[in-house]
Interface confidence: medium
């Protein structure tokens, strides 16, 4: 009978997807590194190809400050970034393929917290959805790491030494060198975020110059050797 046919048709038609978002409960990363915040979704609008906006916010769902936003034009797979807080956030996923995964660069301890992904369909579908529980990003402190140590030509045929280290909390840098006193004045400048640089402006003696980086989690050392009679500086770490 007719009702049987209707039931049969219903039984064989593909069920509409519900809105849902899949995010991990937690992502762990070390300060200074990058982290990926995964977010995928399903939605009930089959083959939606209209304009869409992908948003990530921090703190609390629906009301927290946005840290990233991009918009894709109808039919386009390119999501044009409209907001990336401090330029450290970029979309890894393709929203057209139900993926809003986000990469966060140069992590600092202050980036710890909850992040919420959101997608908005602003064409015919008029719909949107946001992860309510979000993903918790845990940024762990990092022991110091010396990322660059070098000797460079300075004024009046002198040499200067540069030491760049990273860590969270930002490490304190100190230079030590050949006697007398076995230590030399260093100009220390704050780098960006988790990086610091210290300069030894004038290397007055040949010998070994050591940069020490220390924070509450540990210390790291690296050395350069200055032998002017060799005609060029050598380095050792």
């Amino acid at each position: 009978d007719a009702s049987g046919d209707l039931l049969n048709t219903e039984a064989h038609s593909a069920p509409a997807q519900r809105w849902s978002m899949q995010v991990p409960a937690e992502v762990n990363a070390e300060a200074g590194d990058a982290a990926v915040l995964p977010c995928t979704f399903t939605h009930p609008h089959r083959h939606y190809d209209g304009p869409l906006t992908a948003i990530w916010r921090s703190g609390e769902p629906y009301a927290g400050p946005q840290v990233f936003r991009c918009t894709a034009a109808p039919g386009s797979e390119l999501c044009q970034t409209a907001l990336s807080l401090h330029g450290r956030f970029r979309l890894l996923g393709n929203p057209r393929r139900n993926d809003l995964s986000l990469r966060v660069e140069r992590l600092a301890l202050a980036d710890s917290g909850r992040y919420f992904c959101r997608v908005e369909f602003t064409g015919d579908a008029h719909d949107r959805y946001e992860s309510r529980h979000g993903v918790r990003l845990r940024v762990t402190a990092a022991a110091p790491r010396i990322v660059n140590i070098s000797v460079l030509p300075g004024p009046a045929h002198a040499f200067r030494a540069l030491c760049t280290a990273e860590g969270e909390p930002p490490p304190a840098l100190a230079w030590s060198g050949p006697a007398p006193g076995n230590s030399s004045a260093a100009l220390q400048g704050q780098g960006h975020g988790y990086q610091v640089t210290a300069e030894l402006p004038a290397l007055t003696r040949d010998g070994r110059y050591t940069c020490t980086a220390a924070n509450s989690l540990g210390r790291a050392e690296a050395s350069v050797y200055l032998f002017r009679f060799h005609g060029a500086p050598g380095t050792s770490t």
């Epitope: 519900r18 609390e60 629906y62 908005e120």
Partner: antibody, heavy 123, light 107 residues
Framework: QVQLKESGPGLVAPSQSLSITCTVS????????VHWVRQPPGKGLEWLVL???????TYNSALKSRLSISKDNSKSQVFLKMNSLQTGDTAMYYC?????????????????WGQGTSVTVSS | DIQMTQASSSLSVSLGGRVTITCKAS??????LAWYQQKPGNAPRLLIS???SLETGVPSRFSGSGSGKDYTLSITSLQTEDVATYYC?????????FGAGTKLELK
């Protein structure tokens, strides 16, 4: 049937804090969220905050620094606290149920309301 | 924040007549709009959500329409019990915001 009932102090002195309770029946706070909305005398409606079924919260950012919301599912009660009250906070304070709070999405409407509790800020 | 503007703060109406109340959002809210009715001394009552969907128990003489930024609540053959203040509310984004209200007054 679904019911919400607000209770509060009525009169609050300027710079003091306000505590209001919303007691619900006919549904469980484990399954539904609750909004707070206020209405100054003769004026329109202002949304304050929503507490979701799982206890997470969404505040009106303009008032967030002065608001605190919590709940006790077992007692079917939602609590609103507001600090540093001024005369401009004189209003009827309503709690209202957030209608859908499940896998299917979220709908920021308010399908059942309490009768409200009148709060006057005056010395 | 999205501002909601109801053009008329009050409308003079006749029983049995048709009333149209308008609401304009400062940004696109993509049909995420609700209408509430409030009578003096009472709490608001939800009439319509999703711009057009009538809530259970709301008489069919009420209807909602609109898209984008512009929305309308219509009441056909107005009854005495419809004399009230009507508020629109957007729920596209937080914070949720209401219009200032339109009060219906009998001629």
């Amino acid at each position: 049937q679904v019911q919400l009932k607000e209770s509060g102090p009525g009169l609050v002195a300027p710079s003091q804090s306000l505590s209001i309770t919303c007691t619900v029946s006919g549904f469980s706070l484990s399954n539904y969220g609750v909004h707070w909305v206020r209405q100054p005398p003769g004026k329109g409606l202002e949304w304050l905050v929503l507490i979701w079924s799982d206890g997470s919260t969404t505040y009106n950012s303009a008032l967030k620094s002065r608001l605190s919301i919590s709940k006790d599912n077992s007692k079917s009660q939602v609590f609103l606290k507001m600090n540093s009250l001024q005369t401009g906070d004189t209003a009827m304070y309503y709690c209202a149920r957030h209608p859908y709070d499940d896998y299917s999405g979220y709908y920021y409407t308010m399908d059942y309301w309490g009768q409200g509790t009148s709060v006057t800020v005056s010395s | 924040d999205i501002q909601m503007t109801q053009a008329s703060s009050s409308l003079s109406v006749s029983l049995g007549g048709r009333v149209t109340i308008t609401c304009k959002a400062s940004d696109h809210i993509n049909n995420w709009l609700a209408w509430y009715q409030q009578k003096p001394g009472n709490a608001p009552r939800l009439l319509i959500s999703g711009a057009t969907s009538l809530e259970t128990g709301v008489p069919s003489r009420f209807s909602g329409s609109g898209s984008g930024k512009d929305y309308t609540l219509s009441i056909t053959s107005l009854q005495t019990e419809d004399v009230a203040t009507y508020y629109c509310q957007q729920y596209w984004s937080s914070p949720l915001t209401f219009g200032a209200g339109t009060k219906l007054e009998l001629k």
